[in-house]
Interface confidence: low
């Protein structure tokens, strides 16, 4: 079953190549076990950036060497992915799983993008 | 240093089914995309299927999709390839492999660090 999920259209990482962003989804039924996925589109080709499934009201657990780290507050997911740089410019998509209790419901948002600007780097001093 | 073992394959007749199971050691392996590829006799290795570190993302080539299917355990550290409605053009050895991102289903063999030694697929009646 489809389920509509939200998220801002343009984000800006910082100089240390972090960026943050809401995921917000508009949940049928009480949840209490969703998984979270953070796709990126660019050239065509779609990748998986990381994945996380969480009990509500628990914090996302990503993979140890995982880019993202997330904190969930009812029907909001507080996304951040750290380590960008210029060549990961592109547009991230998230994407919500109700995995349970049943029915099953997935919805896809119409992805961020997101802008990463190599700092210059600091001139020798002499 | 990452080291795969292939297993599960055999003779099977046309239509039927096998499961290969590739098992990992290592943690590299566990925590980045990876993929079957085959190589039947005489051909070159080609690709058959790829999935992410997360098992959130799957590719599939056109002349498996809809008939094999890829998953992974990560507790187990355990790839595995679902075959289903084989066909004799199946026929190859069927090696699994690591790649050397997390996220990237990537298509070519130079994108892939680590391979196992290969499990011999034979579809004939």
């Known amino acids: 079953k489809a389920m509509h999920v939200a998220q801002p259209a343009v984000v800006l990482a910082n100089s240390r190549g972090t960026a943050s962003f809401v995921c917000e989804y508009a949940s049928p039924g009480k949840a209490t076990e969703v998984r979270v996925t953070v796709l990126r589109q660019a050239d065509s080709q779609v990748t998986e950036v990381c994945a996380a499934t969480y009990m509500m009201g628990n914090e996302l657990t990503f993979l140890d060497d995982s880019i993202c780290t997330g904190t969930s507050s009812g029907n909001q997911v507080n996304l951040t992915i750290q380590g960008l740089r210029a060549m990961d410019t592109g547009l991230y998509i998230c994407k919500v799983e109700l995995m349970y209790p049943p029915p099953y419901y997935m919805g896809i948002g119409n992805g961020t993008q997101i802008y990463v600007i190599d700092p210059e780097p600091c001139p020798d001093s002499d | 240093e990452v080291q795969l073992v292939e297993s599960g394959g055999g003779l099977v007749q046309p239509g039927g089914s096998l499961r290969l199971s590739c098992a990992a050691s290592?943690?590299?392996?566990?925590?980045?995309?990876m993929a079957w590829f085959r190589q039947a006799p005489g051909k070159e290795r080609e690709f058959v299927s790829a999935i992410s570190a997360t098992g959130g993302l799957t590719a599939y080539a056109d002349s498996v999709k809809g008939r094999f299917t890829i998953s992974r355990d990560n507790s187990k550290n355990t790839l595995y390839l679902q075959m289903n409605s084989l066909r004799a053009e199946d026929t190859a050895v069927y090696y699994c492999?690591?790649?050397?991102?997390?996220?990237?289903?990537?298509?070519?063999?130079?994108?892939?660090?680590?391979w196992g030694q290969g499990t011999l697929v034979t579809v004939s009646s």
């Open positions: 492999a690591v790649g050397r991102e997390r996220w990237y289903l990537r298509h070519t063999e130079n994108e892939y660090d680590y």
């Open positions: 290592g943690r590299t392996a566990s925590s980045n995309a």
